[in-house]
């Protein structure tokens, strides 16, 4: 998920020379940027997170903060440094007048400044009637490993840690960073202050109603008695976790963030840093019945973002709102009428609903998976969560039409066995942000650092696109889709897989002169074809050209329209084998699909031919979907015939390694 998302405001304050010697200009002449929450009521003007460039040392951060104070004082402004960040992000939190922003943006080392904003607990209601605890028969949910090797950090309200359901399972840290409660007559009732956090701790690790009954937890208080916190408080909490991890390294860590605020560049950046330090972060998608990409930390790509479904696997409605959705959601989990510990009394239970509860379920599942396989990386864990999810059970009609294709139809489930999934070739589909409608607009989809991009496709609702291609960016392959003139924008769709010891490269064939079409194959010894992409510069790709058919017996090559350049993703990995599977329909149809068989994993999905009435191709779980324009607009010419091309792979090496372990 990228910074081009949604209504996020980026205010670049141009450097003006009205006041000479105001401050040194930033190095390299780059302009630091100012960001603030797009949701006005959530803004907290007067408090700012000043983020410094990545390699800035603590001493430089302190010096920059002092410099700001000194220069502000010379102009008659009082400032207060509330916190100096180090360990996760370099920077500082400052209380100052907004008049000083221009000054602050010119300080050395400053990368960007973000105005503080509110974050909120993502559960409702907080005070339903007490209900009796659930009854579990002995033969029901008794997991073999309850997550005992894993520590789950909970950033939430205060919690009643000696509730019977969680006593001894939760260590309350001394961390507290919360804003004052709103309203002059607010009455701080302890049981209400503890309500949200106690319930979630119970959902994660409760003795009788918990998912990971063996997991130990640590709680940090970042939400006040009204369930409200700040981005800055959450950042300081994440920094506290990172410092704790460095001081006393333990086993796998899961961080549960059952909160949401508006899109925040700095909160997403902090989550990214913590994830790259080996911590698994799980967050609520948000309860705003909106695109999760407009909220943080839900929009951070490194975080596992969880939407909420009910007992019927339908998206949860919460009053007039409901669960968030969209490409920034990784999966859904139970989030309606979830029974958990109630802070009303030490033996009470209560039902709460929301994406917080859904995230707590996934945090519990993650704890159990990590306890069974402590060496799992974040990418491996995410892929397993997706793999073991219930597929295609959510009624997508609940989501806005334009979000249906982007929203994963996955409901989290515990693996049938916490061991033995290692032989699988795991892949997932990653959608880019929308490119926007301009003629040269592009969209980029990226895989996680330890995933391989095995194929790249594109999709446009208008059909006006110029295909896609895989290209190197920062030493890693990315998937870039191109909009066409008059198009409403495109999506890039990356197929991201776990392929240990893989060596992948892209082979390109320029547009062919001959009428046979363009073709490219994997010529290196031991390399197999995992995906095909095509990209063209012409606005309309030969609408009346006859379709190109793949020559028989040549599975290791990509073919395409003669006016397009064709890109083949070729990979070498121990024991990797792939095959091409096609499904063509002679009559025009809005959707053509082809699926990989049991034991094979879909790595590539593309359409033949790549003509302009094809809206695009994308993978849904193990099925390749090719979408075309409404049949009524295409007529039934030969142009209407579309073939979905799937590339299905498996790894004999992974299968053998798994058998040897067993």
């Amino acid at each position: 998920q990228e910074d081009e998302d949604g209504d996020y405001e980026e205010l670049v304050l141009a450097l003006r020379s009205e006041e000479d010697g105001l401050a040194e200009a930033p190095e390299h002449g780059t302009t630091a940027t100012f960001h603030r929450c797009a949701k006005d009521p959530w803004r907290l003007p007067g408090t700012y997170v000043v983020v410094l460039k990545e390699e800035t040392h603590l001493s430089q951060s302190e010096r920059t903060a002092r410099r700001l104070q000194a220069q502000a004082a010379r102009r008659g402004y009082l400032t207060k440094i509330l916190h100096v960040f180090h360990g996760l992000l370099p920077g500082f939190l400052v209380k100052m007048s907004g008049d000083l922003l221009e000054l602050a943006l010119k300080l050395p080392h400053v990368d960007y400044i973000e105005e503080d904003s509110s974050v909120f607990a993502q559960s409702i209601p907080w005070n339903l009637e007490r209900i009796t605890p659930p009854r579990y028969r002995a033969d029901e949910y008794q997991p073999p490993d309850g997550g005992s090797l894993v520590e789950v950090y909970l950033l939430d309200t205060s919690i009643q840690s000696d509730h019977r359901e969680i006593e001894g399972r939760v260590m309350v840290t001394d961390f507290e960073n919360v804003p004052e409660e709103d309203g002059t007559r607010f009455h701080r009732q302890a049981s209400k202050c503890d309500s949200h956090g106690t319930h979630l701790a119970g959902v994660v690790s409760g003795r009788d109603a918990g998912v990971a009954k063996g997991a130990s937890m640590r709680s940090l208080r970042v939400l006040n008695c009204q369930g409200k916190g700040t981005v800055s408080g959450t950042l300081i909490g994440l920094e506290f976790i990172r410092k704790s991890q460095l001081v006393q390294p333990v086993g796998p860590l899961v961080v549960l963030l059952p909160l949401a605020g508006g899109y925040s560049r700095v909160l997403n950046a902090a989550c990214q840093r913590l994830a790259r330090a080996g911590v698994v972060l799980v967050t609520a998608a948000g309860n705003f019945r909106d695109d999760a990409c407009l909220y943080s930390p839900a929009s951070a790509p490194e975080v596992i973002t969880v939407g909420a479904t009910n007992a019927q696997d339908q998206p949860v409605t919460l009053g007039t709102l409901g669960t968030n959705f969209g490409r920034c959601v990784d999966l859904f989990a139970p989030g309606e009428d979830i029974i958990g510990a109630s802070s009303d009394c030490s033996t009470c239970f209560v039902s709460q609903s929301g994406t917080s509860q859904a995230a707590a379920h996934v945090a519990g599942i993650a704890a159990m998976m990590l306890s069974a396989e402590p060496e799992l990386t974040l990418a491996e864990l995410r892929q397993r969560l997706i793999h073991f999810s219930a597929k295609d059970v959510i009624n997508e009609a609940w989501f806005p039409e334009d979000q249906r294709v982007l929203t994963p139809n996955l409901v989290a489930a515990l693996p049938p066995s916490t061991h033995g999934a290692g032989w699988q070739l795991f892949c997932r589909t990653v959608w880019s942000a929308h490119s926007g409608p301009t003629r040269m607009a592009t969209a980029v989809a990226r895989c996680a650092p330890d995933e391989e991009l095995l194929s790249c496709s594109s999709f446009s609702r208008s059909g006006k696109r110029r295909g896609e291609r895989m290209e190197a960016q920062g030493g890693k392959l990315v998937c870039r889709a191109h909009n066409a003139f008059g198009g409403e924008g495109v999506y890039a769709i990356a197929r991201c897989c776990l392929l240990p010891q893989a060596n992948c490269s892209v082979h390109t064939a320029p547009p062919a002169e001959a009428s046979m079409g363009t073709r490219v194959h994997c010529h290196q010894q031991g390399h197999v074809l995992t995906g095909c992409s095509s990209h063209w510069e012409v606005e309309d790709l030969g609408t009346h050209k006859p379709p190109v058919l793949r020559p028989r017996g040549q599975p290791n090559q990509c073919v395409g329209h003669r006016e397009a350049s064709i890109h083949a993703s070729c990979c070498h990995a121990p024991g990797l084998e792939c095959k091409v599977k096609e499904h063509g329909i002679p009559a025009p149809q809005e959707q053509v699909t082809v699926a990989c068989e049991e034991g094979w994993t879909l790595t590539g999905c593309s359409a033949l031919p790549g003509t302009s009435h094809v809206l695009g191709a994308y993978a849904v779980d193990n099925t390749c979907v090719v979408r075309s324009r409404d049949v009524s607009t295409t007529g039934s010419t030969s142009e209407g015939a579309v073939t979905a091309v799937a590339i299905c792979c498996r790894s004999r090496h992974l299968a053998q390694a798994s058998q040897e372990l067993q």
Epitope: R135, R137, D162, S346, T347
Partner: antibody, heavy 115, light 109 residues
Framework: QVQLVQSGAEVKKPGASVKVSCKAS????????ISWVRQAPGQGLEWMGW????????NYAQKVQGRVTMTTDTSTSTVYMELRSLRSDDTAVYYC????????WGQGTTVTVSS | QSALTQPASVSGSPGQSITISCTGT?????????VSWYQQHPGKPPKLMIY???NRPSGISNRFSGSKSGNTASLTISGLQAEDEADYFC?????????FGGGTKLTVL
């Protein structure tokens, strides 16, 4: 190490009150409450109630409700159990134990109610 | 609160295995994962041997094991030793409180 240390034996007359203390050490106090359990001579164990070291909330067994008061002094990490209107059948060894899970027990305090 | 039902006594020879049962209702044993077993030697406080049906605290011999089926929990002691001779009590959560069994005297013959 985790320890619960109780006050010494008491002899009381019927109708009087007794207050037994239990000092906790070696663990994060607020992560567990304290349960009180008694055992009459030659008899089984009887759960009397629980107090939160976190917020002082209590949960008393029906049988002793109205006669028992449990309190906590966080400054000294000490929990108290007071039983009023003592009767001869209140003669027992009184134990404090950590939490509802009762994984650690005090050494016991013998309370004898005799006229 | 009526006590959970335990046999008054069981006995076994050294090296043998014995099982003590603890029967309740679906409002206590059957409804919760929180059944515990305690060992008590004369004049000593009870000692936790099994918690949450089948988990052993650290330091407790793996000769002690717990299980549950429906409304009945069981404690099994294998390879009986002389020092195992003691009273054994089970306990369970109820909706608002705790309940104990009446206790079982284990005699090692």
């Amino acid at each position: 190490q985790v320890q619960l240390v109780q006050s010494g034996a008491e002899v009381k007359k019927p109708g009087a009150s007794v207050k037994v203390s239990c000092k906790a050490s070696g663990y994060a106090l607020t992560s567990y409450g304290i349960s009180w359990v008694r055992q009459a001579p030659g008899q089984g164990l009887e759960w009397m109630g629980w107090i939160s070291a976190y917020n002082g909330n209590t949960n008393y067994a029906q049988k002793v409700q109205g006669r028992v008061t449990m309190t906590t002094d966080t400054s000294t990490s000490t929990v108290y159990m007071e039983l009023r209107s003592l009767r001869s059948d209140d003669t027992a060894v009184y134990y404090c134990a950590r939490g509802y899970g009762m994984d650690v027990w005090g050494q016991g305090t013998t309370v004898t109610v005799s006229s | 609160q009526s006590a959970l039902t335990q046999p008054a006594s069981v006995s076994g020879s050294p090296g043998q295995s014995i099982t003590i049962s603890c029967t309740g209702t679906n409002s206590d044993v059957g409804g919760y994962n929180s059944v515990s077993w305690y060992q008590q030697h004369p004049g000593k406080p009870p000692k936790l041997m099994i918690y949450e049906v089948s988990n052993r605290p650290s330091g407790i011999s793996n000769r002690f094991s717990g299980s549950k089926s429906g409304n009945t929990a069981s404690l099994t002691i294998s390879g009986l030793q002389a020092e195992d001779e003691a009273d054994y009590f089970c306990s369970s959560y109820t909706s608002t409180s705790m309940v104990f069994g009446g206790g079982t005297k284990l005699t090692v013959l």
